[in-house]
Interface confidence: low
């Protein structure tokens, strides 16, 4: 099966490229996992996105974990996913009425 | 399969110049980055320069700035040592080698070349 | 630059045997070590990454642990095919650094 993911190999600050114009169509039978890395730096949060493959994604983000503390300056975090475009942005919460 | 094939080394006279070559197949060096690490006869390892082809970033050791120019071309999927005014000490064997988890501080070289010898002597 | 001494320089053990290699950093490297494994004539491998991740394709013999200054390489039980030299190496900044090498020998 094809997956589909958002990619920017270049990571872009500020803007967690999310947009269609940067989903792709992943490697059939190689790339079966969607990517993100969010590194938090002084200058704002870096993003970059890929589809992987899933032996590459889990070493990286199982290799980052001790990095990964969000909302810290310096911090780096590693995601792994595997449904369609699931690197995309993160749900917006439901404000309680 | 990843492969990364150094040429390009021989014998050279001091004050003289080499260009090694590090070829790569298998993957794309510009979703990566490539290290040229030397190893002196019988001696340990000492890292070089870095480069990362996707912007081309580049860090070099101190014993080897301002002689020594890393780069890369994309289209060819090589890497480059450019290697000016040798000096003895700059005999070694030169491998090149690709990064994981490149971009951050817990990177490691996981697939390495076969090696180049550089022997600078008169 | 960040020194990375290894000990002990060499030692001689026996196929079986359990071997413990060192690594201490001259300062914090958080877990940012790896570990190679080099044979005479052959480029160096990859065992472990990030201190304590065990390269794909590696033995579950080998194990690292460590973090700060203070780093180990374990081989549980010892084979034919570990004896080598194993170098450190931090990544946390550049320069990157290895230790001076630990050359496993047969006893």
């Known amino acids: 099966l094809q997956i589909q993911c958002y990619q920017c190999e270049e990571f872009q600050l500020n803007n967690d490229c999310s947009s269609p114009e940067f989903i792709v169509n992943c490697t059939v039978n190689v790339q079966d996992m969607c990517q993100k890395e969010v590194m938090e730096q002084s200058a704002g949060i870096m993003y970059r996105k890929s589809c992987a493959s899933s032996a590459a994604c889990l070493i990286a983000s199982a290799g980052y974990q001790s990095f990964c503390s969000p909302g810290k300056l310096n911090s780096v975090c590693i995601s792994c996913c595997n449904t369609p475009l699931c690197n995309g942005p993160r749900p917006k919460k439901r404000g309680s009425s | 399969e990843v492969q990364l094939v150094e040429s390009g080394g021989g014998l050279v006279q001091p004050g003289g110049s080499l260009r090694l070559s590090c070829a790569a197949s298998g993957f794309t060096i510009s979703s990566s980055s490539i290290h040229w690490v030397r190893q002196a006869p019988g001696k340990g390892l000492e890292w070089v320069a870095r480069i990362t082809p996707s912007d081309g970033t580049t860090y070099y050791a101190d014993s080897v700035k301002g002689r020594f120019t890393i780069s890369a071309d994309t289209s060819k999927n090589t890497a480059y040592l450019q290697m000016n005014s040798l000096r003895a000490e700059d005999t070694a064997v030169y491998y090149c080698a690709r990064c994981i988890l490149c971009f951050g501080p817990l990177w490691a070289m996981d697939y390495w070349g076969q090696g180049t010898l550089v022997t600078v002597s008169s | 630059d960040i020194q990375m001494t290894q000990s002990p320089s060499s030692l001689s053990a026996s196929v079986g045997d359990r071997v413990t290699i060192t690594c201490r950093a001259s300062?914090?490297?958080?877990?940012?070590v790896a570990w190679y494994q080099q044979k005479p004539g052959k480029a160096p491998k990859l065992l472990i990454y990030?201190?304590?991740f065990l390269y794909s394709g590696v033995p579950s013999r080998f194990s690292g642990s460590g973090s700060g200054t203070d780093f180990t390489l374990t081989i549980s039980s010892l084979q034919p095919e570990d004896f080598a030299t194993y170098y450190c190496?931090?990544?946390?900044?550049?320069?990157?650094?290895f230790g001076q090498g630990t050359k496993v020998e047969i006893k």
């Open positions: 300062q914090d490297v958080s877990t940012a």
């Open positions: 990030s201190a304590s």
């Open positions: 190496q931090q990544s946390y900044t550049t320069p990157p650094t």
